[in-house]
């Protein structure tokens, strides 16, 4: 789970072991500020919780190119 | 530890419904679901349907569609099933299990409870 | 809907001996996002393997899971006395669809 470290920045300092089914995410952001130790992506899932992941993952780079492309298709 | 706590066996007449309980208990409800399935004697497993509590709208198998109802009470961790025109086939013993929402092994389970359709 | 079907129905095998459970699903099940349960008679199902190969918390590594796609195997090393049960296996791509196979019978020859 991520924390804030102040009102501004929210830092990952561990990652979710686990591959999240693309279908069980809402959308993402990534975390890239230097006050934080690494760099990550954080997941809101369906259920509006935060998760840590590491953006060196393949399955982490493929679900944020899959929210990116859901999020320009416009619905119809 | 996680328990599911499921009402008592029921007897009831065909056409009748019955309503079974699924409390939980030591472990949070929010970003869980749970899951109703079925075993009639001598047979398989059979999902009915689930719920997420917090999304208030459940999701029933196509064979069960109509006939049956699946809720969560948040203030109280607790589900519930609900089974409409009963009939003899539905003679079976009834499980809740829960679910991580954001994968969905069925990793804790209800005792089962035996709803018996009987004229 | 997804279709599992399980082979063989039963398996008639000797304590020590080894095990091999089969899992067939009419679409690709993605993710990986299949598992196994055990069940005794009397009892409800245990969770044993989850995401096709991850053993649940408590259970022996004698049981191993292996698969992707549409074919999984659920494999018992050695069958202890306390193995001889019926196994499912169980889908959850879809939290709105899940389905179980017909079961597994593991049984003492």
């Known amino acids: 789970q991520p924390d804030a470290i102040n009102a501004a920045v929210t830092c990952c300092y561990n990652f979710t072991n686990r591959k999240i089914s693309v279908q069980r995410l809402a959308s993402y952001r990534r975390i890239t500020s230097s006050k934080c130790p690494k760099e990550a992506v954080i997941f809101k899932t369906i259920v509006a919780k935060e998760i840590c992941a590491d953006p060196k993952q393949k399955w982490v780079q493929d679900s944020m190119d899959h929210l990116d492309k859901q999020t320009q298709t416009p619905k119809t | 530890q996680v328990q599911l706590v499921q009402s008592g066996a029921e007897v009831k007449k065909p056409g009748s419904s019955v309503k079974v309980s699924c409390k939980a208990s030591?472990?949070?409800?929010?970003?869980?679901?749970i899951s109703w399935v079925r075993q009639a004697p001598g047979q398989g497993l059979e999902w009915m349907g689930g719920?997420?509590?917090?999304?208030?709208?459940?999701n029933y198998a196509q064979k069960f569609q109509g006939r049956v109802t699946i809720t969560a009470d948040e203030s109280t961790s607790t589900a519930y099933m609900e089974l409409s025109s009963l009939r003899s086939e539905d003679t079976a013993v009834y499980y809740c299990?829960?679910?991580?929402?954001?994968?969905?092994?069925?990793?804790?389970w209800g005792q089962g409870t035996l709803v018996t359709v009987s004229s | 809907e997804i279709v599992l079907t399980q082979s063989p129905a039963t398996l008639s095998l000797s304590p020590g001996e080894r095990a091999t459970l089969s899992c067939r699903a009419s679409?690709?099940?993605?993710?990986?996002?299949l598992a196994w349960y055990q069940q005794k008679p009397g009892q409800a199902p245990r969770l044993l393997i989850y995401?096709?190969?991850d053993r649940a918390e408590g259970v022996p590594a004698r049981f191993s899971g292996s698969g992707s796609g549409t074919d999984f195997t659920l494999t018992i090393s050695s069958l202890e006395p306390e193995d001889f049960a019926v196994y499912y296996c169980?889908?959850?791509?879809?939290?709105?669809?899940?389905?179980f196979g017909q079961g597994t019978k593991v049984e003492i020859k």
């Open positions: 719920v997420i509590p917090i999304f208030h709208t459940a």
């Open positions: 169980h889908q959850y791509i879809h939290l709105h669809s899940f389905t």
């Open positions: 299990a829960r679910y991580d929402a954001h994968y969905g092994e069925l990793d804790f």
């Open positions: 030591g472990g949070t409800f929010s970003h869980y679901g």
């Open positions: 679409q690709h099940v993605s993710d990986a996002y």
């Open positions: 995401d096709a190969s």
